[in-house]
């Protein structure tokens, strides 16, 4: 649709994956489209097939190598093209000069675990996954705790303005079931955004000892 609105958004996970979403008003669901990636200073190029995720939206992942390999740097520019089949030919629909380290979205943190739990406190740790060594310590985290009777959207956000892969939750209620999530974001990049939330970690605080105020 020439006068319709389209959107082509891609993010680099800082290692070996570029995830892209292409949407276009009025586009047909069965349209066959691809994303082509052409780096300006690499010998490789890569293609992925856009698969429908909603009525007028398609997504795919450009797998650039082994998950922990450092395939791009801050000086790389990758020309990304959306090509859609029109009859017998492929038509270029969109082009973006993609600066990987300006468009970062890391993988969700993994390996969440309860390090220590008490009646009112819980210490939780996690790990970051497939994050570039270029960041060194220049990462921040957001965490949230789901309390009984509330939704995730209602949970207050706890901000960790440094690379700290643990948190001590306090003022919890004894003998209560909670869930915990965390996400990560590099400080670098004009269009950088938060990672997806981690898988929730369920934990229960210890019951208060009878006759004692803990």
């Amino acid at each position: 649709a020439v006068n319709g609105t389209s959107q082509f958004t891609c993010f680099y996970n800082s290692r070996a994956n570029i995830s892209c979403v292409w949407s276009q008003d009025g586009a047909l669901q069965d349209t066959s489209c691809q994303v082509h990636a052409w780096p300006d200073r690499r010998r490789w190029n890569q293609t992925c097939e856009l698969l429908p995720v909603s009525q007028a939206s398609w997504a795919c992942n450009l797998i650039l190598g082994a998950p922990d390999s450092q395939k791009l740097t801050t000086v790389d520019i990758v020309t990304l093209r959306v090509l859609c089949r029109e009859g017998v030919r492929w038509r270029v629909m969109a082009i973006q000069d993609f600066k990987p380290f300006e468009n970062l979205r890391l993988m969700a943190p993994i390996s969440l675990q309860v390090v220590h739990v008490e009646t009112h406190r819980c210490n939780i740790s996690w790990e970051i996954s497939q994050a570039s060594h270029y960041f060194e310590r220049h990462l921040e985290f957001e965490a949230r705790t789901l309390s009984p009777g509330h939704t995730w959207e209602e949970a207050p956000l706890l901000t960790l303005k440094q690379k700290q892969e643990w948190i001590c939750l306090e003022t919890l209620t004894p003998d209560t079931q909670y869930e915990f999530q965390v996400r990560v974001k590099p400080l670098q990049g004009e269009f950088t955004t938060w990672s997806p939330w981690s898988q929730p970690l369920a934990f229960r605080t210890k019951p208060a000892a009878l006759g004692k105020d803990t």
Epitope: A1, V2, N3, G4, T5, S6, F8, I77, A94
Partner: nanobody
Framework: QVQLVESGGGLVQAGGSLTLSCAAS????????VGWFRQAPGKEREFVAA????????LYADSVEGRFTISRDNAKNTVYLLMSSLKPEDTALYFC????????????????WGQGTQVTVSS
Amino acid sequence: QVQLVESGGGLVQAGGSLTLSCAASGRAFSNYPVGWFRQAPGKEREFVAAITWLSGSTLYADSVEGRFTISRDNAKNTVYLLMSSLKPEDTALYFCAAALKTITRGQNDYSYWGQGTQVTVSS
């Protein structure tokens, strides 16, 4: 904010050539890809060509492919549209527009617009 000013329009005979310029000023303009659109009297605005700043990748409308060439001069913050083998149906008001990240053929994908420059092709 980005400001765009087109120039170079005029009256030309069919088969002739003309070069339009789009000069830009404002915040980090070299990050914004640029497109040319045109609007003939009584018709809708239509896509002509577009270019990305960094790689110089280009996109053309089928009606002008092979006749028009879009280029850019990063040092001058200027985008050019070289129009050759002009036809009377190329007569229109030509606009340049800047997109935030991506060039497409859709005018709604462009955020900043110039005022336009008139091109008239006589037969």
